[in-house]
Interface confidence: low
């Protein structure tokens, strides 16, 4: 229904607590250098406005849209050209052009200095002394340097950051209360950011209709006994969400968001047996609960998947009839049959069927044509099936360090170009999926792996967009994104590559590294292993090995000499030459 | 897009008969089970018959057992209920749903039974 002021109404529905939460998110993904106190200003003058309208829905301005209001916020920043550059160029236009303008601004890659945890007392400290201001700090860091961030799980992080706090700062030892449990929400935070920013890019890329068709999938999955018009009315609702909150409409999403969680929780007959303990929870926590609730029990007499996409006499006709909805259904039938399977291996099979049917159907004999359409299913399925039990395989034998050792030596050969930053963070995040992934029941592995990969490969393919080097890797981010993955496990070491020549200073180490934590002493050394493989792209694993060794050997022997200073100044250039004769 | 459009609702004397239809549009008809579902006014939905995609099986609620009659013509893509005996109790909105969905995803016919 329409409402007289849609700011009132987005008020009212959400509370003031989430309203403010969200406003500040808002504006901290679109003016990612702004500080926490402009922004703080902004949303409290906001906040005032929609409490006038509350009160009276027909004041002035009540009934501007809120992309509107928002906007002519973000516009009237002093100093806007100066801090944003082109940015400001986005205020000269009209809704909705100026909203749009201020999505393509969005820089995932924002330069701001990591997000550094305080020490337990000081923290414990100023969370004490003003817990929303606590608080608001924290959606704003992280906001600002994830534009994507899905902010109604931004705000669920922040109450679980709030939870954290809460406990620990009672505690004697408040350090190891808060490092390992602040460290789990961090890195799932983290994750939740490299996904979120995964649809994003499919809705920004691809339109609704592949997310919805991710959709189906992901919730055919994980609701087989829900029938397919109640999967099409989730996907339909759920698509919906996002492409608001990707759209930077963070109010209409956690409002709608929360609407969806509330229909799942009064139809569950329909939908699941699995949801009561989350719809039993508050908001926050119920909607998050969901998205990642356990797969329902699959029904024990489904037929098999030929009956009515293969064997029937009419499958051309119904195909014709509704493509879409009838490759809808094909869709939630194979994904509902198969939880042990990826999202991005179940599009790839239902695009597969899709060309099938396409060429089939216009042919004499279409039953005869795609009669085998699901053996040649097989080499699809076999190929993600592979890469889990190599990948797995060695991560078991390496560990985390040394398999993402591994995967930054084979993506720096598959493209050289690309920044040694960017190499090494993409190796360690892909590097994890073994910790997150190797260590699920067989049946849970390929999803988790196949669906985390994509996800990071994404984030790598938005990097290179901003400054393209490789050929190889433009090649694999200008397809669909469900054959992203697949095309980098195929890229092989770059020919056209011109090695890099060898720079003494570039393997020149100091005694500061010594007291590093030991996260930055392995970006060291993951950033000495690209340069390397930089300069000798065709190295062994073997040479590469010696070299790696040598190096870790001598940072041990220096960081335990009396004058460390002299060590790594009389043993560095010997390490040096070392590595050149052993790449030689 | 699913679509289904049920009629055949009105006002009826106890004891009288309707018989609703459902036309169904945008899926693969004769591929799933279909049901009636009520909702009487104030009341939550009521799962009140159903039928399987080859329309060899149905299944009644005890309330309506004897008095009604789910049935499809597949070939015309569409779902029947024959109500026969009717008590002022079975007044309520009806629709049909895929599967055993109890969520409503059309907007009903009104089934009102009173002398």
């Known amino acids: 229904e329409a409402h007289k002021s849609e700011i009132a109404h987005r008020y009212n529905d959400l509370g003031e607590q989430h309203f403010k939460g969200l406003v500040l998110i808002a504006f901290s993904q679109y003016l990612q250098k702004c500080s926490y106190d402009e922004h703080a200003k902004l949303v409290q003058e906001v906040t005032d406005f929609a409490k006038t309208c509350v009160a009276d829905e027909s004041a002035a301005n009540c009934d501007k849209s809120l992309h509107t209001l928002f906007g002519d916020k973000l516009c009237a920043i002093p100093n806007l050209r100066e801090n944003y550059g082109e940015l400001a160029d986005c205020c000269t236009k009209q809704e909705p052009e100026r909203n749009e303008c201020f999505l393509q601004h969005k820089d995932d890659n924002p330069s701001l200095p990591p997000f550094e945890r305080p020490e337990a007392e000081a923290m414990c400290t100023s969370f004490k002394e003003n817990p929303t201001t606590f608080m608001g700090h924290y959606l704003h860091e992280v906001a600002r340097r994830h534009p994507y961030f899905y902010a109604p799980e931004l705000l669920y992080y922040a109450e679980q950051y709030n939870e954290i706090l809460t406990q620990c700062c009672a505690e004697a030892d408040k350090e190891s209360c808060l490092t390992p449990k602040l460290d789990g929400v961090k890195e799932k935070a983290l994750v939740s950011s490299v996904r979120q920013r995964m649809k994003c890019s499919s809705m920004q890329k691809f339109g609704e209709r592949a997310f919805k068709a991710w959709a189906v999938a992901r919730l055919s999955q994980t609701f087989p006994n829900a029938d397919f018009a109640e999967i099409t009315k989730l996907a339909t609702d759920l698509t919906k969400v996002n492409k608001e909150c990707c759209h930077g409409d963070l109010l209409e999403c956690a409002d709608d968001r929360a609407e969806l969680a509330k229909y799942m929780c009064e139809n569950q007959a329909t939908i699941s047996s699995k949801l009561q303990t989350c719809c039993d929870k508050p908001l926050l926590k119920k909607a998050h609960c969901l998205s990642e609730v356990e797969h329902d029990t699959m029904p024990a007499d489904l037929p098999a998947i030929a009956a009515d996409f293969v064997e029937d006499q009419e499958v051309c006709k119904n195909y014709a009839e509704a493509k879409d909805v009838f490759l809808g259904t094909f869709l939630y039938e194979y994904s509902r049959r198969h939880p042990d399977y990826s999202v991005s291996l179940l599009l790839r099979l239902a695009k597969k069927y899709e060309a099938t049917l396409e060429k089939c159907c216009a042919e004499a004999n279409p039953p005869a044509c795609y009669g085998t359409v699901l053996a040649e299913f097989q080499p699809l399925v076999e190929e993600p099936k592979n890469l889990v039990k190599t990948n797995c395989d060695l991560y078991e034998k390496l560990g985390e360090y040394g398999f993402q050792n591994a995967i930054l030596v084979r993506y720096t050969q598959k493209a050289p170009q690309v920044s040694t930053p960017t190499l090494v963070e993409a190796a360690r995040n892909l590097g994890r999926v073994g910790t997150k992934c190797c260590t699920l029941p067989e049946d849970q592995r390929l999803p988790c792996v196949e669906d985390y990969l994509s996800a990071i490969l994404n984030r790598v393919c938005l990097l290179h967009e901003k400054t393209p080097v490789s050929e190889h890797v433009t090649k694999c981010c200008s397809g669909s994104l469900v054959e992203r993955r697949p095309c980098f496990s195929a890229l092989t070491v770059d020919e056209t590559y011109v090695p890099k020549e060898f720079k003494a200073e570039t393997f020149t180490f100091h005694s500061d590294i010594c007291t590093l934590p030991e996260k930055e002493k392995q970006i060291k050394k993951q950033t000495a292993l690209a340069e390397l493989v930089k300069h000798k792209p065709k190295a062994t694993a073997e040479q590469l090995k010696t070299v790696m060794d040598d190096f870790a050997q001598f940072l041990d022997t220096c960081c335990k000499a009396a004058d460390k200073d002299t060590c790594f100044s009389t043993e560095g250039p010997n390490l040096v030459t070392r590595c050149k004769d052993a790449l030689a | 897009e699913v679509q289904l459009l049920e009629s055949g609702g009105g006002l009826v004397q106890p004891g009288g008969s309707l018989r609703l239809s459902c036309a169904a549009s945008?899926?693969?008809?004769?591929?799933?089970?279909m049901s009636w579902v009520r909702q009487a006014p104030g009341k939550g939905p009521e799962w009140v018959s159903s039928i399987s995609g080859s329309g060899s099986d149905t299944l009644y609620a005890d309330s309506v057992k004897g008095r009604f009659t789910i049935s499809r013509d597949n070939s015309k893509n569409t779902l029947y209920l024959q109500m026969n005996s009717l008590r002022p109790e079975d007044t309520a909105v009806y629709y049909c749903?895929?599967?055993?969905?109890?969520?409503?995803s059309s907007q009903g016919t009104l089934v009102t039974v009173s002398s």
């Open positions: 749903t895929i599967g055993g969905s109890l969520s409503r």
């Open positions: 945008g899926f693969t008809f004769r591929s799933f089970g």
